[in-house]
């Protein structure tokens, strides 16, 4: 239904707290360099204005669209051009072009310092002094670093943060209570961020149809007892929610997500037997819980799908009459039978089926032609299964750090032109797949591994798009989203690459490395490893292991030495010489 005042409508639906949080996220995601105080001021102004519209929907400007209202606010910020350069040009445009322009200027890799967590005492003090401001800072800092973070989900993580602080700040040992809990939230939030960015990429590059196909596959796996009409309805609603969030329409997105959660909880009987626990929770927890609810028990004795999709003489007629519905039904039937497959694999199978029908239905004897589709699926299914087996075996042998290093070597060889920080970030993230997925039961490994890898590789593509340097990466990133992971897996050593010359300073370390946290030490060592591979792309695993072991030994020795500086300055050059010799 149409509302006289959109802003009043959203304020009423969402309530003041969520309204303010979402507006803060929206502004922080659009203008990523502004300080918290600048944004907080704008949020307060917008909220005050929303309240006047709630009191009187006919008041001046209350009938304006949210894009107009928010865009006008952003464009009124002083020194916009000095701080944001050409983003200020967006303000010369009219809606909807102005909002599109803002979206195009979102930076996936803003040059902001890493979000440092204050020490426990300081954190608890500022939280107790003003919990609202404290949580506002959290939303601002996460949103500006992750400009496509799923806004209603960020409110959920802020709520988690709040609950952890409330609990731990009352403990005697605040530090040991806070650290593991906040680390857990941070890890989950980072994964949520790359997953959502993937969804937005799908929407931006391939449109709603591509996202809806993703949603049909995912929902069919989770709700195998729901019928096709129900899955289609859920997929349509979920597509709308994600389109809004990816498009910066965060109030509408959060409101529609709440509506979708309400619908699911009111229709459990036709959706899934596993929803009740989620539906008993308050809004943010409920929506989060529904988004990762366990798969419903699959109905036993589902028939083979060949009857409808291969053996039926009417296949081509059914396909021609309603292509998207027929393919959607195929995807639904395949996905509900295969919770053990990744969504990416299911979409590749549907794509192969579509291509087969396009080809075969134009031939003289279509059934003879599409009758072989089953055999054509075999390599598509076996490739990711082998990938999971090989990589999980390697992870179990090497552990997370060693596995990251193996991936780092592999990816530096595939795309040595990519910057070392990007390669290290990618390898570290890709390597976490082992810890995240390889410990799961067999039938959950493939979906976990492949869908996570796809999301990480999407980030690699986004970063590479800004400064394209590798033809290998460009090739894999310009294809369809579901083909990316197999494309990257199939890449081999880039034979066109001219090795980097050996620079001693790249491998020169100082005693300050000894006091770094373990994670930072690892990054330093992995940076050196990537540089070694760039110097010798065809170095064997043995050679690289020798050098890295020597390097680890050197760090261990010098960090334990009484005079660390002397040890680093005398032993360092020896290490460099040994490295050069080992790789010669």
């Amino acid at each position: 239904e149409a509302h006289k005042s959109e802003i009043a409508h959203r304020y009423n639906d969402l309530g003041e707290q969520h309204f303010k949080g979402l507006v803060l996220i929206a502004f922080s995601q659009y203008l990523q360099k502004c300080s918290y105080d600048e944004h907080a001021k704008l949020v307060q102004e917008v909220t005050d204005f929303a309240k006047t519209c709630v009191a009187d929907e006919s008041a001046a400007n209350c009938d304006k669209s949210l894009h107009t209202l928010f865009g006008d606010k952003l464009c009124a910020i002083p020194n916009l051009r000095e701080n944001y350069g050409e983003l200020a040009d967006c303000c010369t445009k009219q809606e909807p072009e102005r909002n599109e322009c803002f979206l195009q200027h979102k930076d996936d890799n803003p040059s902001l310092p890493p979000f440092e967590r204050p020490e426990a005492e300081a954190m608890c003090t500022s939280f107790k002094e003003n919990p609202t401001t404290f949580m506002g800072h959290y939303l601002h800092e996460v949103a500006r670093r992750h400009p496509y973070f799923y806004a209603p989900e960020l409110l959920y993580y802020a709520e988690q943060y709040n609950e952890i602080l409330t609990q731990c700040c009352a403990e005697a040992d605040k530090e040991s209570c806070l650290t593991p809990k906040l680390d857990g939230v941070k890890e989950k939030a980072l994964v949520s961020s790359v997953r959502q960015r993937m969804k937005c990429s799908s929407m931006q590059k391939f449109g709603e149809r591509a996202f809806k196909a993703w949603a049909v596959a995912r929902l069919s796996q989770t709700f195998p007892n729901a019928d096709f009409a129900e899955i289609t309805k859920l997929a349509t609603d979920l597509t709308k929610v994600n389109k809004e969030c990816c498009h910066g329409d965060l109030l509408e997105c959060a409101d529609d997500r709440a509506e979708l959660a309400k619908y699911m909880c009111e229709n459990q009987a036709t959706i899934s037997s596993k929803l009740q626990t989620c539906c008993d929770k308050p809004l943010l927890k409920k929506a989060h819980c529904l988004s990762e609810v366990e798969h419903d028990t699959m109905p036993a004795d589902l028939p083979a799908i060949a009857a409808d999709f291969v053996e039926d003489q009417e296949v081509c007629k059914n396909y021609a009459e309603a292509k998207d519905v027929f393919l959607g039904t195929f995807l639904y039937e395949y996905s509900r039978r295969h919770p053990d497959y990744s969504v990416s694999l299911l979409l590749r199978l549907a794509k192969k089926y579509e291509a087969t029908l396009e080809k075969c239905c134009a031939e003289a004897n279509p059934p003879a032609c599409y009758g072989t589709v089953l055999a054509e699926f075999q390599p598509l299914v076996e490739e990711p299964k082998n990938l999971v087996k090989t990589n999980c075996d390697l992870y179990e042998k090497l552990g997370e750090y060693g596995f990251q290093n193996a991936i780092l070597v592999r990816y530096t060889q595939k795309a040595p032109q990519v910057s070392t920080p990007t390669l290290v970030e990618a390898a570290r993230n890709l390597g976490r797949v082992g810890t995240k997925c390889c410990t799961l039961p067999e039938d959950q490994r493939l979906p976990c591994v492949e869908d996570y890898l796809s999301a990480i590789l999407n980030r690699v593509c986004l970063l590479h798009e800004k400064t394209p340097v590798s033809e290998h990466v460009t090739k894999c990133c310009s294809g369809s989203l579901v083909e990316r992971r197999p494309c990257f897996s199939a890449l081999t050593v880039d034979e066109t690459y001219v090795p980097k010359e050996f620079k001693a300073e790249t491998f020169t370390f100082h005693s300050d490395i000894c006091t770094l946290p373990e994670k930072e030490k690892q990054i330093k060592k992995q940076t050196a490893l990537a540089e070694l591979v760039k110097h010798k792309p065809k170095a064997t695993a043995e050679q690289l292991k020798t050098v890295m072991d020597d390097f680890a030994q050197f760090l261990d020795t010098c960090c334990k030495a009484a005079d660390k500086d002397t040890c680093f300055s005398t032993e360092g050059p020896n290490l460099v010489t040994r490295c050069k010799d080992a790789l010669a």
Epitope: L302, A306, E382
Partner: nanobody, 124 residues
Amino acid sequence: EVQLVESGGGVVQPGDSLRLSCAASGGTFSTYVMGWFRQAPGKEREFVSAISQNSIHTYYANSVKGRFTISRDNSKNTVYLQLNSLRPEDTALYYCAASRFTSWYTADYEYDYWGQGTLVTVSS
């Protein structure tokens, strides 16, 4: 981890019958689709027959339709394949396989667990 052990193979003459059994352990048998595949010397492995969890659906390769019958007993964690009117071309190593998740029933790549096989030889 599901373990499958086939039995019942042997040497028979054309036209004779055999009953193959496959005993499963280590999983909830009633949640698995069960299948039989065979591999003749020098040939690729091929689908023979499959049965759904509660025996509602059964599937057969065209070459065995009307001669072979698949059945299962969930209380005994066992699947059977009755082979009648055997022919020399039925000579092969017969494998039992289990799948939690299948769209086709006939695709070997959808089966996660396999037995070692039992040999059937049909010869005059």
